[in-house]
């Protein structure tokens, strides 16, 4: 009889065990499923108002396929330049081919004419390779012009239809990148 | 308002590894990228590595194929793995979250990696 109580206690423990690791686990379900929601509460927000005018590029940026362009109305250094692309969850300009250039350059003509943009390359102080912010080679086409004789870090910049270089610390208008918004039409 | 943690630093040898972690908490739709800063006692802080919404990186020169920036949106949590370290990555790391034009960026309060045999 002892042992018949003894069985079915240990029955009871053995539910009741599971039944905590049930509840443990719909609790992590629940934790999870809030961050999710989190999560969809956010894109939603930020989608709203890019969804109200169903532009895939923010007001007063420039689309081309699947990219947007931001061009400057300010100055300031290269690496200010990048902290204000960042502002905006976009990047200094990485040219990827020489359409993109073309592109480009022909935009800044109509816009603003011949001035400087910073764009998202730099030379790297030991080996001298120019790089995109990416990690990336330039392709051989789109390496900058030798213009700079600077003993200070060398960065990249457009000018009318070239790619040319000089010191990072000067003041240039810069050009901002980011994906434009795919249609969901 | 956010605000953003970072853990992960401490003491390593020259060519050793470590992941830094930066938590962002509260709200994290106004955050368009983030960031991580160095800074080295008697030095400007300088961004090291940076992530987009869009999930575009970015890296310094000094740091370029030794470093990776990655994020982890289920956790609202972004990371820098750092490999093959060299005594001058010792710093103060910190990261930033980057909000639109014309507003104000929140720091972290930083965490610190010392690199020395």
């Known amino acids: 009889k002892l042992l018949q109580v003894s069985t079915i206690a240990m029955q009871q423990q053995e539910k009741l065990i599971q039944q905590e690791r049930a509840l443990l686990n719909f609790t992590e379900w629940k934790r999870s499923c809030a961050l999710q929601m989190k999560y969809c509460q956010a894109f939603m927000q930020n989608s709203l108002s890019s969804a109200h005018n169903s532009s895939p590029c923010p007001n007063n940026w420039i689309q081309n396929r699947e990219s947007c362009y931001y061009v400057s109305e300010i100055w300031s250094i290269w690496h200010t330049s990048q902290e204000n692309c960042l502002k905006e969850g976009s990047t200094l300009l990485q040219i990827e081919s020489k359409e993109e250039m073309d592109f480009i350059t022909g935009s800044l003509r109509k816009i603003k004419g011949s001035y400087d943009y910073w764009v998202g390359l730099s030379q790297d102080g030991h080996s001298g390779r120019w790089l995109w912010q990416d990690g990336s080679s330039p392709s051989p086409g789109l390496l900058p012009a030798e213009r700079s004789q600077s003993a200070n870090q060398v960065c990249g910049y457009v000018k009318s239809n070239s790619l040319l270089s000089s010191n990072c610390s000067t003041w240039k208008y810069f050009i901002c990148e980011k994906y434009a918004l795919r249609s969901s039409v | 308002q956010v605000q953003l943690q970072e853990s992960g630093g401490g003491r390593v040898q020259p060519g050793g590894s470590l992941r830094l972690s930066c938590a962002a908490i509260?709200?994290?739709?106004?955050?368009?990228?983030i960031g991580w800063y160095r800074q080295a006692p008697g030095k400007q802080r300088e961004l090291v590595a940076a992530?987009?919404?869009?999930?575009?990186?970015n890296y310094a020169n000094s740091v370029q194929g030794r470093s990776t920036i990655s994020r982890d949106n289920v956790n609202n949590t972004v990371y820098l793995q750092m490999n093959s370290l060299k005594p001058e990555d010792s710093a103060v790391y910190y990261c930033?979250?980057?909000?639109?034009?014309?507003?104000?960026?929140?720091w972290g309060q930083g965490t610190q990696v010392t690199v020395s045999s």
């Open positions: 930033k979250g980057f909000t639109g034009w014309g507003k104000e960026d929140y």
């Open positions: 509260g709200s994290i739709f106004e955050i368009n990228s």
């Open positions: 992530i987009t919404s869009g999930g575009i990186t």
